[in-house]
């Protein structure tokens, strides 16, 4: 789903307050709800009728450093006989997410939010038919 | 997918540098790749064999303020005849994502990362059979 544009108003102080110096803000250390965990049914990527593989991307200057991307294995979906049915389609489910980018020059470290598009998994759909003139 | 624990090392300066004052860091205003957009096939939540609905949660002190959660419509999956087949299961696909929490006391505004569990959509799976003693 979409993350709206900041318009940067979210990060501004109330109008009656002095502006943020040097275009930066104070980010407190620590993460709220850090222990919260995904509780998905096991191995759904293999058990799905629209199965997918995972690819891990790693960047030490990003938090989280590891971002996992899904790729649908087939164009079609897997039927009850375990065969690919291409009258149906496996399609990716995408999500916009935030990561934190670390930038450093010597001992001066700053951070910036970055929007990343993550393919989370796949689902089986009836394709939309377009009549081409 | 899982976001690892920070261990707070990501946000620390190199060991040879003076520590971060007051447990906070500098977050630059603006978002990298802000214009990046989801490009999913249209209405997949209705066209899927494991369809879902969306619920929007809104919080003005969170960025993004709008977080969309999916809920699978059925226990089973929709077959070619448009009927629910309960030999298969619709299961949620979850993703851990980061949001920014805004905290203010008067003109003092600070921000903190928060982990949120988002259900992005649903997929149709073969249920795992557990033999209960």
């Amino acid at each position: 789903r979409k993350i709206p544009k900041v318009g940067h108003t979210f990060f501004q102080k109330p109008e009656s307050c002095p502006p943020v110096p040097g275009g930066s803000m104070k980010l407190d250390i620590g993460i709220i709800n850090e222990n919260q965990r995904v509780s998905m049914s096991r191995n759904i990527e293999s058990r799905s009728t629209s199965p997918w593989n995972y690819t891990v991307t790693w960047d030490p200057n990003r938090y989280p450093s590891e971002v996992v991307q899904a790729q649908c294995r087939n164009l079609g979906c897997i039927n009850a006989q375990g065969k690919e049915d291409i009258s149906m389609n496996s399609v990716p489910i995408q999500q916009e997410t935030l990561v934190v980018r670390r930038k450093h020059q010597g001992c001066s470290v700053s951070f910036q939010l970055e929007k990343v598009l993550v393919t989370v998994g796949c689902t089986c759909v009836t394709p939309v038919i377009h009549h081409v003139q | 997918r899982k976001i690892p624990k920070v261990g707070h090392t990501f946000f620390q300066k190199p060991e040879s540098c003076p520590p971060v004052p007051g447990g906070s860091m500098k977050l630059d205003i603006g978002i990298i790749n802000e214009n990046q957009r989801v490009s999913m096939s249209r209405n997949i939540e209705s066209r899927s064999t494991s369809p879902w609905n969306y619920t929007v949660t809104w919080d003005p002190n969170r960025y993004p303020s709008e977080v969309v959660q999916a809920q699978c419509r059925n226990l089973g999956c929709i077959n070619a005849q448009g009927k629910e087949d309960i030999s298969m299961n619709s299961v949620p696909i979850q993703q851990e994502t980061l949001v920014v929490r805004r905290k203010h006391q008067g003109c003092s505004v600070s921000f903190q990362l928060e982990k949120v569990l988002v259900t992005v959509g649903c997929t149709c799976v073969t249920p795992v059979i557990h033999h209960v003693q």
């Epitope: 649908c72 164009l75 389609n89 990716p92 394709p127 939309v128 377009h130 081409v132 | 096939s41 066209r47």
Partner: nanobody, 116 residues
Framework: QVQLVESGGGLVRTGGSLRLSCSVS????????MGWYRQVPGRQRELVAM????????YYADSVKGRFTISRINANNTIYLQMNNLKPEDTAIYYC?????????MGQGTQVTVSS
Amino acid sequence: QVQLVESGGGLVRTGGSLRLSCSVSGDISSQSAMGWYRQVPGRQRELVAMIHTTKGDTYYADSVKGRFTISRINANNTIYLQMNNLKPEDTAIYYCTHNEPGDLYMGQGTQVTVSS
């Protein structure tokens, strides 16, 4: 924008052969397929044959297996449907299709008539 150009339909006697061709232009992803559906007025559209654009995997309806062969020339994104030992029940409008995940683009169709 996807464009499809079909050719090769016509009238043929039972047991005869025809070759349909179709070329596709526009945005083509690696996870896509090209093929043919057919439709008899008043009946449901039927998938006849499909070929995966990168893997080259082929799929056939049970009713045409062993008689129809789908092939593809990668260089110009053209597919062919070689139809042998045609039967009266093969009479239909044949639509060239290009399938991107979630979207099926369908041409204007070409009539195939098999007379007994």
